[in-house]
Structures are given as C-alpha cells and as structure tokens.
C-alpha cells in the first residue's frame, strides 16, 4: 500500500490520544536503556509503511503483536485516514486470523515495540522532510 | 533516570569558534533527536539545531547562516555543538534537550553553558 | 519562518486565581505546540506537549488548549511555585520557533 495520501495530521492525533499511551503501557516495567532502534524511516509515507510492517507482519520470535490494543488502533487509523488501505487489508486480515495464537510478550516483542515507539517518533517529527 | 550534563563556561574572543558538549545518561543515546536551543541574558529561546544521533541527520535554523556544527559520538553517549565566527550578540546560556517518548517535545534539558563573546 | 507571539509579555494573578497566557501563530501549525516552564536560574521544563497532552508529573491545574494558529495555557488556580516565564513553542515546520515568553507574577 502506498501510504502518500494519508491524512498524516489526523494519523498523528490518533497516535497521540491513544497509540502511544498503549505502547507505554505495553513497555512498562522494561527499562529504557534495554533497546537500540535499528529501522529508521526519512519521511511520513516510509515511515507509515515501517510502522505497518513491524506492527502487523509476524516475525520470528514475535507473532502476536496484531492483536494487541495498539495494533487494532494503528489499523483503525490507517483505515480511516487512508484512502483505500481497508481494501488491500481484506485478505491480510483473512490469513492472520488462520494463524491466531495467544498472546505471549516475549523479549523479541518488546524490542519490536520499542523500534515502533522510535518510528513513530520520526512519524511525528520528520527531522530533515517536514511535511 | 535521563541526564544532560553539559561542559562548562566559556569566554571567547569575537571571531573565534567554541564547542559545546553534552553528555547523555540513563537512556538509550541512539534513539532519541537531540536539540539544542540557546538563551541571550535576559530574552527567549532560540532553536539552533537538531541531531539523531543514530544515523548522525541533522536540521539547522538557517539563522546561523551555516555558522553551526552539530555532531554526536555515540560511543560516548555525546552531542557536541560547535558555533564559529562568533560575535558578542552570541553571549548566552546554550542548551542541549532530548525529545521524548512522541517526538512533539523536548523532556530533558541539560543545566546550561554559558558562553561569553568579549575581546 | 513562523512567528509564535505571546500575550501578555508580564502577568499579576492573586494567588488561587486563573491565569491565562496566549500564543498566536504567524501561520497554521496544527496542534504542534508545545509549552515550557523556566524559573529564574533553571533550564526550561516541559509543561504541554501537542497544545493539551500533560506532561508526566505536570499538575492539573495546567491545561492547554487551541489548534491553528490560536492558543491558550491556563492555571486554573495559582500556586506560588508557578511563578516563572512560560513558553509557547511550534514543531510543526523547521525552523523551530518559540514564543517570546509571559512573566508570571503573584499580585
């Protein structure tokens, strides 16, 4: 999905009210200094597709983060303020219900949030293209 | 806990050049923008630039006419600001600040250098 | 660049009363504005961030509110600790620009 015409505005008020809050709360008790950011982005649009790919594509050691709070708001956001994301989303969603599994926050998911946390970071403050 | 420790005060002649550093601890140096924002006696804030000390990006007000230098050392969990061709409208408390956890703010702020331009 | 100017430049406030300081943007930043707090001597601390959003720590007697080019901090009721400059800063284009900043005073 080409996320360039996204209403980044809007997307960002989301996160601020609600996404972030539950990143932290899904932090917590993990100690600020526990992860390095390895995956940057340089502008809203990669940014966008990063936080999408990390957020809802399993990975090894990490398979549930999908259906935590912050995901089921970050793809509520995504659907509404970008024009036709809900439609490519369809058979992504039909595969990932197949592969459900239960909840597990293992270290490899901390990481990842925390490498959410910093793309959202650069999202919300491109440094070097202000959009 | 998050510190800013920045060196100490300095006295410059007009023309010359001086490097401001600022020392980060408790958090995770690479992940975090660094700012910094300087204070003339008696007046308001002033943004001078901005670094993200992991890929070593940086965003300068155009103000300072390429005048600032700012840089980081991540193996010493460091930024450093260099200002040149100084002036005495230069005289002023210089800051460092981290952004925080959004990215719309900055929540640590170093306790200040002051820089003093005099011949 | 976008200018943030603030009014008034000084304030007097009875202690336990309202206070009120506006910022005014030169051109629309959104909701990208940011309060700071400086007492005399210190560094400035972070009171708001994006116009409403408390900071960890900041008591609620702070508020902000506006978008677009109008903003306001208000203290709902004033504490002699709040006794300081305050700032307004947009992040919403580079450069980044702060207001010139309200002295708060007690009556």
């Known amino acids: 999905y080409d996320f360039t015409n996204c209403d980044f505005e809007k997307i960002k008020a989301a996160y601020l009210s609600t996404i972030s809050k539950d990143l932290i709360t899904y932090m917590s008790g993990t100690k600020s200094t526990e992860f390095n950011n390895t995956v940057s982005c340089s502008n809203r649009p990669h940014c966008l597709t990063e936080i999408q790919s990390l957020t809802f594509n399993p990975t090894a050691g990490c398979a549930s983060l999908a259906k935590e709070m912050f995901a089921m708001k970050t793809k509520a956001a995504l659907a509404i303020w970008c024009p036709g994301y809900s439609e490519t989303q369809i058979n992504a969603t039909q595969a990932m219900k197949k592969r459900r599994k239960r909840k597990v926050t293992t270290n490899k998911c901390l990481e990842q949030v925390s490498q959410l946390q910093g793309l959202w970071r650069r999202f919300n403050r491109p440094l070097l293209k202000q959009q | 806990e998050v510190q800013l420790v920045q060196s100490g005060a300095e006295v410059k002649k007009p023309g010359s050049s001086v490097k401001v550093s600022c020392k980060a601890s408790?958090?995770?140096?690479?992940?975090?923008?660094i700012e910094w924002v300087r204070q003339a006696p008696g007046q308001g804030l002033e943004w001078m630039g901005v670094?993200?000390?992991?890929?070593?990006?940086?965003n300068y007000n155009e103000n300072f006419k390429g005048r600032v230098t700012i840089t980081a050392d991540k193996s010493t969990s460091t930024a450093y600001m260099e200002l040149s061709s100084l002036r005495s409208e230069d005289t002023a408390v210089y800051y460092c600040?981290?952004?925080?956890?959004?990215?719309?703010?900055?929540?640590?702020w170093g306790q200040g250098t002051t820089v003093t331009v005099s011949s | 660049d976008i200018v943030m100017t603030q009014s008034p430049d000084s304030l007097a406030v009875s202690l336990g009363e309202r206070a009120t300081i506006n910022c005014k943007a030169s051109?629309?930043?959104?909701?990208?504005v940011t309060w700071y707090q400086q007492k005399p001597g210190q560094s400035p601390k972070l009171l708001i961030y994006?116009?409403?959003n408390h900071y960890t720590g900041v008591p609620d007697r702070f508020s902000g509110s506006g978008s677009g080019t109008d903003f306001t901090l208000t203290i709902s009721s004033l504490q002699a600790e709040d006794v300081a400059v305050y700032y307004c800063?947009?992040?919403?284009?580079?450069?980044?620009?702060f207001g010139q900043g309200t002295k708060l005073e007690i009556k």
């Open positions: 600040a981290r952004e925080d956890n959004t990215g719309t703010a900055f929540d640590y």
């Open positions: 408790g958090g995770t140096f690479s992940n975090y923008l």
């Open positions: 670094i993200d000390p992991g890929v070593g990006d940086t």
């Open positions: 051109q629309s930043v959104s909701s990208d």
């Open positions: 994006y116009v409403s």
């Open positions: 800063q947009q992040h919403h284009r580079f450069p980044l620009t």
